[in-house]
Amino acid sequence: GSERTCCPINWVEYEGSCYWFSSSVRPWTEADKYCQLENAHLVVVTSRDEQNFLQRHMGPLNTWIGLTDQNGPWKWVDGTDYETGFQNWRPEQPDNWYGHGLGGGEDCAHFTTDGRWNDDVCRRPYRWVCETKLDKAN
């Protein structure tokens, strides 16, 4: 068959998915586009085990994930259901805070330095993680 059995070079395999960890920073929309160009998407976190795996690889870095409410409700970029799925927000988050002085609220989610999630201004440049299923990697 045409399915791949291993991840591309510089990608990390975990539980049937391949992950790529950026070493530079970009706004959420640019990070999202980058992943799409790699035939992938911003990481969608579906379990505590996956969360722990990602944390081990990231260290204390604010890092974009594929979760946004730019178009209304919170949605994962791959269509995974948000309401019934795994969530790991910092206490009192998300809060759509307007007090940052950067304009507007906060519509994009990221890993904070302790791994818990926060909503932040989408145009802030953070690191990011791309994910693709193992049989779609190229």
């Epitope: 206490p91 950067l102 904070t112 330095t113 302790d114 791994g115 909503d119 802030r124």
Partner: antibody, heavy 121, light 107 residues
Framework: EVQLVESGGGLVQPGRSLKLSCAAS????????MAWVRQAPKKGLEWVAT????????YYRHSVKGRFTISRDNAKSTHSLQMDSLRSEDTATYYC??????????????WGQGVMVTVSS | DIQMTQSPTSLSASLGETVSIECLTS??????LAWYQQKPGKSPQLLIS???NFQDGVPSRFSGSGSGTQYSLKINSLESEDAATYFC?????????FGGGTKLELK
């Protein structure tokens, strides 16, 4: 009222060990990342180490990595800093500090009174 | 690591005067800056977070401003209790780094 109380400081010879402890009260300890920050005599402040809320990850400044170990006990609302292979440049007042969880912020919002560590022969 | 350059290192002013302390960062920290006050023999106290949000209980004569790589702390109508050392902190990325401090003395 948030309170952080350090203990365990003192005079120690170079190469020896010392363990600092911090007892926390007045807040939900298991929600917060905790840190140690030090201040050498007449000098500025220097972050030393952080342990995240559940103890799952720890972070250190380069100069103490491999010599210092930060840990926590959420059941007892305490955390500690085990300092091994101490050097004269580790001489400082060590502060236990709570890190905020507000948004993506990590600043230190509450500090203990500090405990002096002197490394000298 | 993000470098923090704080100025001046010391400052002498009279009661009622207004003073400013500057903090320059080696890269854009997107307002992730806090200011602390430390009195001799005491631990630091948080004055301002996120560049301009002052903490509960902090007198309104303290204010913070700035963006990008340039930030400042302003103290209006100095009072005797303001004599202290002031530090800035960036918490934009690890490791957190402090400015070298500004010692404020009252004439």
């Amino acid at each position: 009222e948030v309170q952080l109380v350090e203990s365990g400081g003192g005079l120690v010879q170079p190469g020896r060990s010392l363990k600092l402890s911090c007892a926390a009260s007045g807040f939900t300890f298991s929600d917060y990342n905790m840190a140690w920050v030090r201040q050498a005599p007449k000098k500025g402040l220097e972050w030393v180490a952080t342990i995240i809320y559940d103890g799952g990850s720890t972070y250190y400044r380069h100069s103490v990595k491999g010599r210092f170990t930060i840990s926590r006990d959420n059941a007892k609302s305490t955390h500690s800093l085990q300092m091994d292979s101490l050097r004269s440049e580790d001489t400082a007042t060590y502060y236990c500090a709570r890190q905020t969880y507000f948004g993506s912020r990590d600043y230190f919002d509450y500090w203990g009174q500090g405990v002096m560590v002197t490394v000298s022969s | 690591d993000i470098q923090m350059t704080q100025s001046p290192t010391s400052l002498s002013a009279s009661l009622g005067e207004t003073v400013s302390i500057e903090c320059l960062t080696s890269e854009d920290i997107y307002n992730n800056l806090a200011w602390y006050q430390q009195k001799p023999g005491k631990s630091p106290q948080l004055l301002i977070s996120y560049a301009s949000n002052f903490q509960d209980g902090v007198p309104s004569r303290f204010s913070g401003s700035g963006s990008g790589t340039q930030y400042s702390l302003k103290i209006n109508s100095l009072e005797s209790e303001d004599a202290a050392t002031y530090f800035c902190l960036q918490d934009s990325e690890y490791p957190p780094t402090f400015g070298g401090g500004t010692k404020l003395e009252l004439k």
